[in-house]
Interface confidence: medium
């Protein structure tokens, strides 16, 4: 197969946006499958176009509707003949147009009167490309060859810059870059105490406007009253805009405020936010839990728990928890130190514990009281006789010894 490109010079230059038709003449084959290749890659061309000139002479067309810069390159056509690929002479297609920006000036944020640079680069073809700089509507530099760097000694207000690229085909204007002045950040807002315990507080806030300079840190200041002595000041890197305040005194009134800083300095403080740490949960377990058999069921009694200090606050109701081997279980809340237990099965062992609660939660459980089923069956004493089945289980009221009794495996026993 003798292949040659027909009617096209070796170098073809077209203007951007113009249509291009490359043709390729194939002689010496009856049914060539003409494929076009650009820079080594086969060009997909769904409208395969073959024009028979004669039985062994064909013309293939590659049609580009609108030439773009990306169409520029080295083209050739190829056909397969007896397992061999025949390749035509190449055509170098150049697409000329107004300059194309490869680097445009970027938006910046700078401190007042600080020097900065802006960059601009554009390419042809055709070359050469020259650059002119504009500040607002005033031409301030150039023409200079591309690429170009504009050095600015400083600005005192937000200012617009752009560059213009020129070649023989015309001119192109870059994007407009805005150079903003950096400032101190605005005060944070939505300062919230998100989680409170007796000694810790979690704080979160939303940052105010950053003044176009990266926020570097925020300071959380804590006092025991607004304007009082500073108890704590924590500097946290940001983001995230959160802070954990540790080692606070339980049941105490505090106030906090937050400010954030960028490279230029700190923001104003946000408003004071008051909060109160929680008191302590009761420290003691009720003592001397015992049972009294009555006609109507079982009465449980225990000794009153006295607060160990003001941080525990007022002690509220008692919580009674009981469980049986058959899986029956329940919890009661009672105001006093006495509870009437109903709904249990006297034929099964019964395990009972009690704790005292306050606003924070329940204190430690008492030692468990085990009421055996045979004790119920065998008890012959008169009604209201006081029989105590206090059976210590383990050495600590705070510990759950799962191995002693299957009842301890119930999740309701976990505090």
């Amino acid at each position: 197969a003798g292949l040659k490109l027909m009617g096209a010079p070796v170098k073809l230059t077209v203007s951007q946006g113009q249509p291009v038709k490359l043709n390729c003449s194939v002689e010496g084959m009856e049914e060539p499958d003409i494929q076009w290749v650009k820079d080594g890659a086969v060009v997909q061309n769904l409208d395969q176009l073959y024009i028979p000139v004669s039985e062994q002479h064909w013309i293939g067309f590659l049609s580009l509707k609108s030439a773009e810069r990306s169409d520029a390159g080295r083209y050739w056509c190829q056909v397969e003949d007896g397992g061999e690929t025949e390749i035509s002479q190449p055509v170098w297609l150049t697409v000329e147009g107004v300059p194309f920006f490869t680097v445009e000036p970027k938006d910046l944020a700078v401190p007042p009167n600080a020097p900065f640079q802006l960059s601009c680069e554009a390419v042809g073809p055709p070359e050469p490309v020259t650059i002119v700089w504009w500040r607002g509507t005033t031409k301030i530099g150039g023409p200079a060859p591309s690429p170009s760097v504009l050095n600015v000694t400083g600005v005192t207000q937000s200012t617009m810059f752009s560059c213009e690229a020129h070649n023989l085909k015309g001119l192109a204007s870059s994007r407009t870059a805005t150079v903003h002045l950096q400032a101190l950040p605005a005060a944070p807002f939505n300062v919230t105490v998100t989680k409170l315990s007796s000694s810790n507080a979690s704080v979160a806030w939303m940052p105010g406007a950053d003044g176009r300079a990266l926020l570097q840190s925020c300071t959380v200041q804590v006092t025991q009253a607004p304007g009082g002595w500073e108890v704590l000041a924590v500097v946290v890197p940001v983001p995230p805009f959160t802070c954990l305040l540790r080692d606070l005194v339980p049941a105490t009134n505090y106030s906090l405020r937050v400010r954030c800083a960028n490279a230029l300095g700190p923001s104003p403080y946000a408003d004071w936010v008051p909060f109160q740490t929680k008191g302590l949960a009761p420290a003691s377990a009720p003592q001397n839990l015992h049972a009294i058999r009555t006609d109507s069921g079982l009465i449980l009694e225990w000794e009153e728990v006295i607060p160990e200090g003001p941080l525990e606050g007022p002690l509220g109701p008692y919580k009674l928890s009981w469980v049986q081997d058959n899986g029956t279980q329940d919890e009661l809340t009672v105001e006093g130190t006495r509870a009437n237990l109903t709904g249990w099965d006297p034929q099964k062992d019964l395990i009972v514990r009690v704790c005292v609660s306050n606003a924070v939660g329940c204190g430690p459980w008492s030692q468990p009281l085990v009421v055996s089923s045979h004790d119920h069956a065998g008890q012959q004493g008169p009604p209201h006789s006081r029989t105590s089945w206090l059976v210590p289980r383990g050495s600590s009221a705070h510990h759950h010894h799962h191995h002693h009794h299957s009842a301890w495996s119930h999740p309701q026993f976990e505090k």
Epitope: E31, D33, V43, Q48, I51, P52, F61, K65, S66, E68
Partner: antibody
């Protein structure tokens, strides 16, 4: 005179295989690509894919890639559209289409098209 | 996947000019083709390569393309022009072709 003769209407059950055909006459079959176009009842045209018979090169639309196979038999000047497993959503009219370029004077072609009459495929259980 | 967008319907009175648009991101780079399909018939090519009228098509049919929009214009629409019209083009890299959703032209 250029003619594209398509195979007759067909009714199939879901999961069945099917091949429909388009036989060309009145021109050199290998000169021009043939494409297949689907039209569901009351809906628009959808380009499925094409084949260049002289090289058996194919292109498929993204929705049809892997679901249908386009092939050609140069000896009988016939193009084929094949399904291995039909679905109810394949119910449609299928057209084969062939472009035709004619030079008048120089080498700039004038563009014509020929459409087959269509093959109605119904997939129903 | 690439899409060509057409208005679902266009209505004109006989003798008026009908314009049907087709928009697609690759149309600055790829040619648009227009087809006419009358009820129960196979489609017929009306315009190829944006603006060239296919053989046997009346002169009142013309095509144009600018940027991402191609337009089929029927100057002095006739009752017999009532049909569905489809635009057709390729995706930007030429890997596959697509039809627009079709526009129903009503000539009242």
């Amino acid at each position: 005179e250029v003619q594209l003769v398509q195979s007759g209407a067909d009714v199939k059950k879901p999961g069945a295989s099917l091949t429909i055909s388009c036989q060309a006459s009145g021109y050199t079959f290998t000169d021009y690509w043939i494409s297949w176009v689907r039209q569901k009842p009351g809906k628009g045209l959808e380009w499925m894919g094409q084949i260049v018979p002289r090289a058996s090169r194919t292109n498929y639309g993204p929705s049809f890639q892997g679901h249908v196979t386009i092939s050609a038999d140069r000896s009988t000047a016939t193009a084929y559209l094949q399904w291995r497993s039909l679905e109810a959503s394949d119910t449609a009219m299928y057209y084969c289409v062939r472009p035709y370029f004619q030079t008048s004077g120089g080498t700039i072609p004038e563009y014509y098209q020929h459409w087959g009459p269509g093959t109605l495929v119904t997939v129903s259980s | 996947s690439y899409e060509l967008t057409q208005p679902p319907s266009v209505s004109v009175s006989p003798g008026q000019t009908a314009r049907i648009t087709c928009s697609g991101d690759a149309l600055p780079k790829k040619y648009a083709y227009w087809y006419q399909q009358k009820s129960g018939q196979a489609p017929v090519l009306v315009i190829y390569e944006d603006e060239k009228r296919a053989s046997g098509i009346p002169e009142r049919f013309s095509g144009s393309s600018s940027g991402t929009m191609a337009t089929l214009t029927i100057s002095g629409a006739q009752v017999e022009d009532e049909a569905d019209y489809y635009c057709y083009s390729q995706e930007r890299n030429g890997n596959y072709a697509v039809f627009g959703g079709g526009t129903k032209l009503t000539v009242l």
